[in-house]
């Protein structure tokens, strides 16, 4: 805690200037008034303050706005943002995008912090939902942002905002998220032509079942062996070797180079190798010939 | 071109008096807050005295507190240190340098090259 | 005021080498730490800032880490436009205040 002491005659700040980095930490909380700041809080930005200085400024915030700051002051906070705690920014009401942006490119550069984590979810909550325009701007500081929501929070995002989703932002997102987002991509995606709506959908692909696999190898697609070992085993699994092939076009020859990965190996292993040996790439593990294949799920499902 | 080039430096005897020049060029010199800072021999850097853009703010190291005066001409583009009561623990090279702020924090942006004063009878 | 002690005032090394600048300050500066480079009779040259972040032109061979109290500046591969004397300065607290200084020079 600073000491209350009177401001010395002739320091009283009659303004937020770069005057009051020459002031110790009692004169600025002697100094400054903190209706004053508030007022002036877009010039804090520009000034070099020192670390203490900031801190004496906030607790000055602090002190105005106990229940929380109003949103005209934290559009200005500029660097001081970064002094804030979670716990300060669970009292704000963020509404303006822009404000959100204003913040975030304060900490750009930098990893996600807990205050900007705690920003965004009350941004987010205070919205509803993840719109366009927020997904738009957190991706852009944050590439990876999508893949950090839980399935839970992916299922509040509006199909319309996967416009916004660029094929980085998707790196690092497990299955059970694109699970989430695929439906999503689809429907977003669904007015588009052939080639086109692969190139957009082609990111989202390690939620997709079967059904859409078997789908997209009819139209020519050239799936490339990345995006093919991204796929979920289970809707690898029952392509036939003419539709993996139709699938990967050119690309089927990496196959090979994949043969002991997944989904790859799991997929030979449920192939007869006499298909397998179609394909003229020397992969095998197949199921041999005059072998019966019994679907066991199948017959559970049956019984 | 950002520039700083101090003058003024030279032999002074002990209870005497200089006045050091630092012209700046290549920024808006009344923006930005200023400072002296000295490296005396062998030693490391010390601040001395600063001065906001306006010059309606100073603040001064302990160590010459009643004995320096900091001050600026805008229109010259040029700061200023008068130097009184010299001792020889004053000997040093004096530097000017600019305050900016980089991602937040604060830093000394821009120097000039030095003035050296050697305090000495 | 905080005081800033560099370690080692001075060193000897060779073109390649990788080398290592420490400074300790007497209280906590969370990570309000600058470092400067001064080549003899020139400027000194604000280097690394905020303890990490490399000002613009600086190059990538130089790094710095650390946090609280105890900071080091890092050159991977020492060139010959490296020699220099680096200083830290604490931002954290008014006044500014520098260690004092380490002299890198040819082995």
């Known amino acids: 805690e600073v000491e209350k002491t009177a401001c010395p005659s002739g320091k009283k700040a009659r303004e937020i200037d770069e005057s009051l980095i020459f002031y110790k930490k009692w004169e600025l909380e002697a100094c400054v008034d903190a209706a004053l700041l508030a007022t002036q809080m877009d010039r804090v930005n520009a000034i070099p303050f020192t670390y203490e200085q900031l801190d004496v400024l906030k607790h000055k915030l602090d002190e105005l706005y106990p229940q929380g700051y109003p949103e005209s002051v934290i559009q200005h906070l500029g660097y001081l943002f970064l002094k804030m705690s979670p716990e300060d920014i669970r009292k704000w009401n963020v509404t303006s995008l822009e404000t959100l942006k204003a913040l975030l490119e304060v900490n750009k550069g930098h990893e996600m912090s807990p205050q900007v984590a705690t920003l965004i979810d009350r941004f987010v909550k205070g919205r509803g939902q993840l719109d366009k325009d927020t997904l738009d701007t957190l991706t852009a500081f944050y590439p990876g942002y999508l893949c950090s929501l839980s399935p839970e929070e992916l299922s509040s995002v509006p199909p319309s905002s996967i416009w916004a989703v660029r094929p980085q932002d998707l790196d690092t997102c497990d299955p059970r998220q694109l699970d989430v987002l695929y439906p999503k991509a689809r429907l977003a995606f669904q007015n588009m032509n052939g080639s086109e709506y692969f190139v957009k959908i082609q990111s989202f692909l390690g939620g997709a079942p079967t059904e859409d696999l078997k789908a997209l190898s009819q139209q020519n697609v050239s799936m490339d062996l990345a995006t093919f070992m991204k796929l979920r085993t289970d809707a690898v699994l029952p392509l036939t070797v003419a539709e993996v092939q139709k699938l990967l076009g050119p690309h089927v020859e990496g196959l090979k180079a994949e043969e002991r990965h997944r989904p790859v190996r799991d997929w030979i292993l449920r192939q007869r190798q006499d298909d397998l040996d179609t394909l003229g790439l020397g992969l095998q593990g197949g199921i041999p010939n005059g072998y019966l294949v019994l679907d066991l799920s199948m017959q559970e499902a049956l019984s | 071109e950002v520039q700083l080039v101090e003058s003024g430096g030279g032999l002074v005897q002990p209870g005497g008096s200089l006045r050091l020049s630092c012209a700046a060029s290549?920024?808006?010199?009344?923006?930005?807050?200023m400072s002296w800072v000295r490296q005396a021999p062998g030693k490391g850097l010390e601040w001395v005295s600063g001065?906001?853009?306006?010059?309606?703010?100073?603040g001064y190291a302990d160590s010459v507190k009643g004995r320096f005066t900091i001050s600026r001409d805008n229109s010259k583009n040029t700061l200023y240190l008068q130097m009184n009561s010299l001792r020889a623990e004053d000997t040093a090279v004096y530097y000017c340098?600019?305050?900016?702020?980089?991602?937040?924090?604060?830093?000394?942006?821009?120097w000039g090259q030095g003035t050296l004063v050697t305090v000495s009878s | 005021d905080i005081q800033m002690t560099q370690s080692p005032s001075s060193l000897s090394a060779s073109v390649g080498d990788r080398v290592t600048i420490t400074c300790r300050a007497s209280?906590?500066?969370?990570?309000?730490l600058n470092w400067y480079q001064q080549k003899p009779g020139k400027a000194p040259k604000l280097l690394i800032y905020a303890t990490s972040r490399l000002q613009s032109g600086v190059p990538s061979r130089f790094s710095g880490s650390g946090s609280g109290t105890d900071f080091t500046l890092t050159i991977s591969s020492l060139q010959p436009e490296d020699f220099a004397t680096y200083y830290c300065?604490?931002?954290?607290?008014?006044?500014?205040?520098f260690g004092q200084g380490t002299k890198v020079e040819i082995k």
């Open positions: 209280q906590s500066i969370s990570n309000w």
């Open positions: 300065q604490q931002s954290y607290s008014f006044p500014w205040t």
């Open positions: 340098a600019k305050h900016g702020q980089v991602g937040g924090i604060s830093v000394f942006d821009i």
């Open positions: 001065i906001s853009g306006s010059g309606g703010s100073t």
């Open positions: 290549g920024f808006t010199f009344s923006s930005y807050a």
